[in-house]
């Protein structure tokens, strides 16, 4: 028995930040679980982890240097990533493990979300146009 995960196929991070919502076919209310976000086709980089516990505040952390936060819904976890770099444009996969109460459950691998990080470009301001042609 596996949990199904739905993610947006693509998101664009315009201000080097993005909200990625992982929607599960499972209600996380009063469960102990570990939700995580992984970067790359091989999911090699664990970007962010959210630990949920029935009795404690949500624990959110990254061991790989990402600036992340997490928000819990009944059947979803939303990862808020900030300070992303253009070279962090990649595919990101949601993962969920429900530990307690038993039985242990995890998810079928999702299709992932391509996060396209748009760099902050200095655009010419309309108040200070460039030199006009004669």
């Amino acid at each position: 028995n596996k949990i199904l995960v739905k993610q947006s196929p693509m998101l664009v991070a315009y201000d080097n930040a993005v909200n990625l919502s992982c929607k599960y076919s499972y209600n996380l209310f009063s469960r102990e679980f570990r939700a995580s976000l992984h970067k790359g086709l091989d999911s090699a980089v664990e970007v962010c982890v959210v630990y949920g516990n029935y009795s404690q505040q949500l624990q959110v952390y990254s061991k790989t240097g990402f600036n992340c936060d997490g928000k819990l819904g009944n059947e979803s976890v939303t990862f808020y990533l900030q300070n992303l770099y253009v070279n962090q444009t990649d595919i990101y996969f949601c993962k969920i493990e429900v530990m307690y109460p038993p039985p242990y459950l995890d998810n079928e691998k999702s299709n992932g979300t391509i996060i396209h990080v748009k760099g902050k470009h200095l655009c010419p301001s309309p108040l200070f146009p460039g030199p006009s042609k004669p």
Epitope: Y100, P101, P102, P103, D106
Partner: antibody, heavy 120, light 111 residues
């Protein structure tokens, strides 16, 4: 046949660290459906759960020991490890590894245990 | 944490006696109609051995004189006819929530 064999026990100085091994046979530590826990028993006392590792490699620890404990594994050796730091006399115990199935989480197979004595 | 309280802490019985040990949890350990409460037997110098899982399911290879019952917070281990090899310490354990916890044990001694 499922078997768990612990090793690495002995005399350790207070403040030191221990690293115990649990060699598994008859099943794979990375196969979905089973996990392994570490449990300890102080001389003449009851059983205390330390933590566990799932087939995925995710770990879960007892809050009272979380700051001092690390559970890891080597899939190529099908071996589980327990690292416990900043040892004190109260950590003197027999340390067991025990397997559980995801269905009920009951510990269906146990190792023979390894004794750790913390003393100067 | 879920506290498990066993009673009695020790008991003296004779071969052939019916023995009952109770385990009370500080909160329900039931989920979707299943009780995550297990019973183990431990003999001196040996590792514990699983007898009963999920409150009432007999572990493979365990004699049928052992049985378990109960749900919610109150559970019972019964040995219908005590045998010489049954003199040991018995523990209940919950796996409903982490940290997993054990009862303090019940020592069954020869009268």
């Amino acid at each position: 046949e499922v078997q768990l064999v612990e090793s690495g026990g002995g005399l350790v100085q207070p403040g030191g660290s221990l690293r115990l091994s649990c060699a598994a046979s008859g099943f794979s530590l990375s196969t979905s459906g089973v996990g392994v826990s570490w449990i300890r028993q102080a001389p003449g006392k009851g059983l205390e759960w330390i933590g566990e590792i799932y087939h995925s490699g995710s770990t879960y620890y007892s809050p009272s020991l979380k700051s001092r404990v690390t559970i890891s594994r080597d899939n190529s050796k099908n071996t589980l490890y327990l690292q416990l730091n900043s040892l004190r006399a109260e950590d003197t115990a027999v340390y067991y590894c025990a397997r559980y199935e995801y269905y009920s989480y009951a510990f269906d197979y146990w190792g023979q245990g390894t004794l750790v004595t913390v003393s100067s | 944490d879920i506290q498990l309280t066993q009673s009695p802490s020790s008991l003296s019985a004779s071969v052939g006696d019916r023995v009952t040990i109770t385990c009370r949890a500080s909160q329900s350990v039931d989920f979707h109609g299943k009780s995550f409460l297990h019973w183990y037997q431990q003999k001196p110098g040996k590792a514990p051995k699983l007898l009963i899982y999920a409150a009432s399911s007999l572990q493979s290879g365990v004699p049928s004189r052992f049985s378990g019952s109960g749900s919610g917070t109150d559970f019972t281990l019964t040995i219908s006819s005590l045998q010489p090899e049954d003199f040991a310490t018995y523990y209940c354990q919950q796996s409903y929530r982490s940290p997993r916890t054990f009862g303090q044990g019940t020592k069954v001694e020869i009268k």
